[in-house]
């Protein structure tokens, strides 16, 4: 708490200007009117205040707006935003995408801070859903944003927003998240033709079920190995050798290098060795010829 002291003669601030950088903390407290500061917040960013001086300015705004700052002030906070705590931000009602962008810009180049996470949470909750423009903005600043959301939070993403998602935005998503996003992507891209559809859906295929992979295998898509390795193991296991060959096209030869890794390893264990031999890749570990394969899960379902 800065002590209340009288403003020295001639130092009362009539506007927010560069002269204030030479004010001591107590002078800022005594000589700057909070209402003046609030109306001229847009000037603060261009003035090289120290963090200690910014602390004083924040304190003045906190006194003026104990229930939380109005959006007219929030959108001009600039570097003062870095001084806000998540508790401060929870009092805000941010509705404008421009305000969100302005504050994200301040944090650009840094990891997502608790302040930014709280701001985004407040903004998205206020909007009711993660619309395309918001998602566009958030993934532009934080490519990993989408994958930081829980499957429950992702369920509020409308299919139309999926158009804003870039492949790199999904890099850190786990299968549970892709399970939620894939059906939305399928719906969003449903009117595209084969090759265009595959380009768009490819990043989301980690959430695709077996029947969709079977359908893709009929479309000469030539899936690359990196995408194949990200598919759900349970979705890959039922695929036949012929279907995998069609799905991968010329990339099928890459299976050899991945034969010890999931899902390729598990898939090999489920295939007949003579079917694997037809690929001519030297894949080993399939079911030896003459062995009978019992699907125990089917047997349990019948009993």
């Amino acid at each position: 708490e800065v002590e209340k002291t009288a403003c020295p003669s001639g130092k009362k601030a009539r506007e927010i200007d560069e002269s204030l950088i030479f004010y001591k903390k107590w002078e800022l407290e005594a000589c700057v009117d909070a209402a003046l500061l609030a109306t001229q917040m847009d000037r603060v960013n261009a003035i090289p205040f120290t963090y200690e001086q910014l602390d004083v300015l924040k304190h003045k705004l906190d006194e003026l707006y104990p229930q939380g700052y109005p959006e007219s002030v929030i959108q001009h906070l600039g570097y003062l935003f870095l001084k806000m705590s998540p508790e401060d931000i929870r009092k805000w009602n941010v509705t404008s995408l421009e305000t969100l962008k302005a504050l994200l810009e301040v944090n650009k180049g840094h990891e997502m801070s608790p302040q930014v996470a709280t701001l985004i949470d407040r903004f998205v909750k206020g909007r009711g859903q993660l619309d395309k423009d918001t998602l566009d903005t958030l993934t532009a600043f934080y490519p990993g944003y989408l994958c930081s959301l829980s499957p429950e939070e992702l369920s509020s993403v409308p299919p139309s927003s999926i158009w804003a998602v870039r492949p790199q935005d999904l890099d850190t998503c786990d299968p549970r998240q892709l399970d939620v996003l894939y059906p939305k992507a399928r719906l969003a891209f449903q009117n595209m033709n084969g090759s265009e559809y595959f380009v768009k859906i490819q990043s989301f295929l980690g959430g695709a079920p077996t029947e969709d992979l079977k359908a893709l295998s009929q479309q000469n898509v030539s899936m690359d190995l990196a995408t194949f390795m990200k598919l759900r193991t349970d979705a890959v296991l039922p695929l036949t050798v012929a279907e995998v060959q069609k799905l991968l096209g010329p990339h099928v030869e890459g299976l050899k290098a991945e034969e010890r890794h999931r899902p390729v390893r598990d898939w090999i264990l489920r295939q007949r060795q003579d079917d694997l031999d037809t690929l001519g890749l030297g894949l080993q570990g399939g079911i030896p010829n003459g062995y009978l394969v019992l699907d125990l899960s089917m047997q349990e379902a019948l009993s």
Epitope: E18, I21, P48, T50, V106
Partner: antibody, heavy 115, light 111 residues
Framework: QVQLVQSGAEVKKPGSSVKVSCKAS????????FSWVRQAPGQGLEWMGG????????NYAQKFQGRVTITADESTSTAYMELSSLRSEDTAVYYC????????WGQGTLVTVSS | DIALTQPASVSGSPGQSITISCTGT?????????VSWYQQHPGKAPKLMIY???KRPSGVSNRFSGSKSGNTASLTISGLQAEDEADYYC???????????FGGGTKLTVL
């Protein structure tokens, strides 16, 4: 339209002083920070010091402390920079600039120190 | 004394993008967002191109953009044009000395 107009070129003897002026027009003068920056031939920019006219007190780069005096006259919206004990290495173009971000610059004043 | 470090020269062909770096310390570039970039053509006064790390003054082309990571600020010029050939200086407000510090300048050549 903001303009900073500086005084003309000067030729000075070593050991003497030079005073360069910078007249501002087209904007408030008193509450802005005015800097002086110099540039020796073929060299980079070097900040010398600055002043907020309404306060009158200036601050200086350590290198020039004691040799440079920056003043301002609010009535004529003019900032001044005086450099004393001149030596040949002070030969440079001297600029005034407005604000800490230096959004407007004067045209520059060439000061030549030569015996 | 040069407080900020810039490459002495960079070059690029018309239409290309180039980036000029400016490295300082946590008390100038790193600690605060008060980094500016200036363009200077031979025989002319410097011109402000970027202030507060990434803001463009009105009248400056959007081909010029600024950013910062840690103690290093960067100026990127996209779609290089012949008139971009000039010297570029970064500057930062240093709170320790309450003054401005500059980089040594970077000569940009458009091939």
């Amino acid at each position: 339209q903001v303009q900073l107009v500086q005084s003309g070129a000067e030729v000075k003897k070593p050991g003497s002083s030079v005073k360069v002026s910078c007249k501002a027009s087209g904007g408030t003068f008193s509450s802005y920070y005015f800097s002086w920056v110099r540039q020796a031939p073929g060299q980079g920019l070097e900040w010398m010091g600055g002043i907020i006219p309404k306060f009158g007190s200036a601050n200086y780069a350590q290198k020039f402390q004691g040799r440079v005096t920056i003043t301002a006259d609010e009535s004529t919206s003019t900032a001044y920079m005086e450099l004393s004990s001149l030596r040949s290495e002070d030969t440079a173009v001297y600029y005034c600039a407005r604000r800490t971000s230096m959004d407007y610059w004067g045209q520059g004043t060439l000061v030549t120190v030569s015996s | 004394d040069i407080a900020l470090t810039q490459p002495a020269s960079v070059s690029g062909s018309p239409g290309q993008s180039i980036t000029i770096s400016c490295t300082g310390t946590s008390s100038d570039v790193g600690g605060y967002n008060y980094v500016s970039w200036y363009q200077q053509h031979p025989g002319k006064a410097p011109k402000l191109m970027i202030y507060s790390v990434s803001k463009r003054p009105s009248g400056v082309s959007n081909r010029f953009s600024g950013s910062k990571s840690g103690n290093t600020a960067s100026l990127t010029i996209s779609g290089l044009q012949a008139e971009d050939e000039a010297d570029y200086y970064c500057g930062a407000w240093a709170h320790m000395s309450l003054g401005k510090v500059f980089g040594g300048g970077t000569k940009l050549t458009v091939l």
